[in-house]
Amino acid sequence: SIPWNLERITPPRYRADEYQPPDGGSLVEVYLLDTSIQSDHREIEGRVMVTDFENVPEEDGTRFHRQASKCDSHGTHLAGVVSGRDAGVAKGASMRSLRVLNCQGKGTVSGTLIGLEFIRKSQLVQPVGPLVVLLPLAGGYSRVLNAACQRLARAGVVLVTAAGNFRDDACLYSPASAPEVITVGATNAQDQPVTLGTLGTNFGRCVDLFAPGEDIIGASSDCSTCFVSQSGTSQAAAHVAGIAAMMLSAEPELTLAELRQRLIHFSAKDVINEAWFPEDQRVLTPNLVAALPPSTHGAGWQLFCRTVWSAHSGPTRMATAVARCAPDEELLSCSSFSRSGKRRGERMEAQGGKLVCRAHNAFGGEGVYAIARCCLLPQANCSVHTAPPAEASMGTRVHCHQQGHVLTGCSSHWEVEDLGTHKPPVLRPRGQPNQCVGHREASIHASCCHAPGLECKVKEHGIPAPQEQVTVACEEGWTLTGCSALPGTSHVLGAYAVDNTCVVRSRDVSTTGSTSEGAVTAVAICCRSRHLAQASQELQ
């Protein structure tokens, strides 16, 4: 019967006793940077070409005996997971292997860098179809390795990497911390984070999604027909590399940004038990388990968005945090979050010709996060409209006044140290949903976009009594672009988007009391693109 991991990534409409995905990734080449491999294994023979590239350090220890089957173990298994005939994800994908890890599974940054350069040169000499590079390795943070990944990604290559098996923040490791790389954590058959001895899968904001990574059956280098179970984020990354190969084979023109958004969109949502992660990492870690799309075509009509968290600002008074979207993505809204509740809001600002989301810490605050909502919106023209603090008691308000521009997000930023504990709530005037409102001491920023067929609406959910969390979700067919809190009197810790739901967090109920002053309203801006929908109908 079908191994659990292949069943897990298969959408229900394709589920059967056997794994029969609609397309095998035959138009895509996957490069594997790992150990040597046993290329005559029946799973991968004829599918994996062993390149002449080898750059590995000497094995440690004088008593180390180089045994071929041990040297090949990791790479052979991963090659099988990606494209193996029997237990592979993308059964049609061809692969090329580069040896950058020695028989003990150790490599160097320089060896990996030279390997990436080898791929770049190969691509220039003989351009083929879409390329996926699988980096099932993790080492300490390396600016130079991340930069090399960025260069290759910007040349059109999709890089997929393991989050690392250190039960730690993936941002502390490379290439996992490179924003351009698709970073994959590992889950088990129960959709729980994988534990490996005393350690386990890495987590945090640098992880894009999770994938099966425990007890994964694949080719064993012991013999040409042998299979074995292995576990780790390498195996998880191999699943995503296989899924990416299949998506790219179905839609070869997909950009890295489009592919990443689709991987996120088609993932299983909210199935991971977040209690496994350290408390401060839960909100930052995506609750997503990779899956194949239910159909390899026809996803183009959707407006895809994802949430990008910044690094923590640090606790200094004037500290700021910046969240950025990928080059092909539009920043449609910006929010902020602070565990202490002491923050001075956020604003969208231009940086290097592109909008970024900047959050501001407040005096006495432990630091803030900036949260960007990054979307794929072709032919978009977006700008930020700002209203400075108002004189009037009605509060500050700003709307999209340009013809054809719609509101996609609201941000507010204030100079005073602590806003909201002693100010009366601001009520939005009825019949004026296409505007952002805020405290009179705050400057308000509206993200206004024009794109063919783009329409947006505001959806609110208010709770009169204090609640630690208030949510509002966009309905089917609409995508959450903006998430903010209507300024009330309770201490709002911040707002952020989780998939298609806007979450507003407040300080612990026990500290705010249960008066009407604790009212919190979550405001979601939900958008859709009629233009994209029509375009996809024409294509089908």
Partner: antibody, heavy 119, light 113 residues
């Protein structure tokens, strides 16, 4: 149910060509390997080769390499064993067998095709 | 190639008695990564295709009576029929499936004494 059905018995002359078939049903033919096994009269089992119908990848036993050709047509869930020039020593019962990947062994067998080569 | 050698070539056992067949491989078929022996046993009755009895050297295929058992590891293996029944008259083959070419033993014919 899962089964492999082989083509009927053949009587041929030396030097003639022949293609026998093995049709799978009740399972995803593309995803399972098919082996061919020879059994000469009164003798034991000899593995000839294997094919993966998904991509028609084949492996042959050195004893049969160049002597026979194994192929498959996944659109009709059928594997084939063929000879371009038969010899009297090819007289035997030929079995196809499904190979289950995780326990690479033969869990389902065809009923066999008897090939007789005689002048 | 891995050569499989069975003994004896033939065996006559009384009904209800134990039958033991040995099989030796020219090299080990035990692999450390999953601690499995890549060895199977098949039964072939006259005029029928072979039938899988045992895999991984000792795991009984579903539907196979529990009087059939397999044991051994590495290079030496045994198929035991604990209490021979009339329907067990057949030729039994061992097979290694760890590497290509897949090879069978020459067969052991079991008859009733």
């Amino acid at each position: 149910q899962v089964q492999l059905v082989q083509s009927g018995a053949e009587v041929k002359k030396p030097g003639e060509s022949l293609k026998i078939s093995c049709k799978g049903s009740g399972y995803s033919f593309t995803n399972y390997w098919i082996s061919w096994v020879r059994q000469m009269p009164g003798k034991g089992l000899e593995w000839m080769g294997i094919i993966y119908p998904g991509d028609s990848y084949t492996r042959y036993s050195p004893s049969f390499q160049g002597q026979v050709t194994i192929s498959a047509d996944k659109s009709i869930s059928t594997a084939y064993l063929q000879w371009s020039s038969l010899k009297a020593s090819d007289t035997a019962m030929y079995y196809c067998a499904r190979d289950y990947w995780y326990k690479p062994l033969f869990d389902i067998w065809g009923q066999g095709t008897l090939v007789t080569v005689s002048s | 190639d891995i050569v499989m050698t069975q003994s004896p070539d033939s065996l006559a056992v009384s009904l209800g008695e134990r039958a033991t067949i040995n099989c030796r491989s020219s090299q080990s078929v035990l692999y450390s990564s999953n601690n499995k022996n890549y060895l199977a046993w098949y039964q072939q009755k006259p005029g029928q295709p072979p039938k899988l009895l045992i895999y991984w050297a000792s795991t009984r295929e579903s539907g196979v009576p529990d009087r059939f058992s397999g044991s051994g590891s590495g290079t030496d293996f045994t198929l035991t029929i604990s209490s021979l029944q009339a329907e067990d008259v057949a030729v039994y083959y061992c097979q290694q499936y760890s590497s290509f070419p897949i090879t069978f033993g020459q067969g052991t014919k079991v008859e009733i004494k």
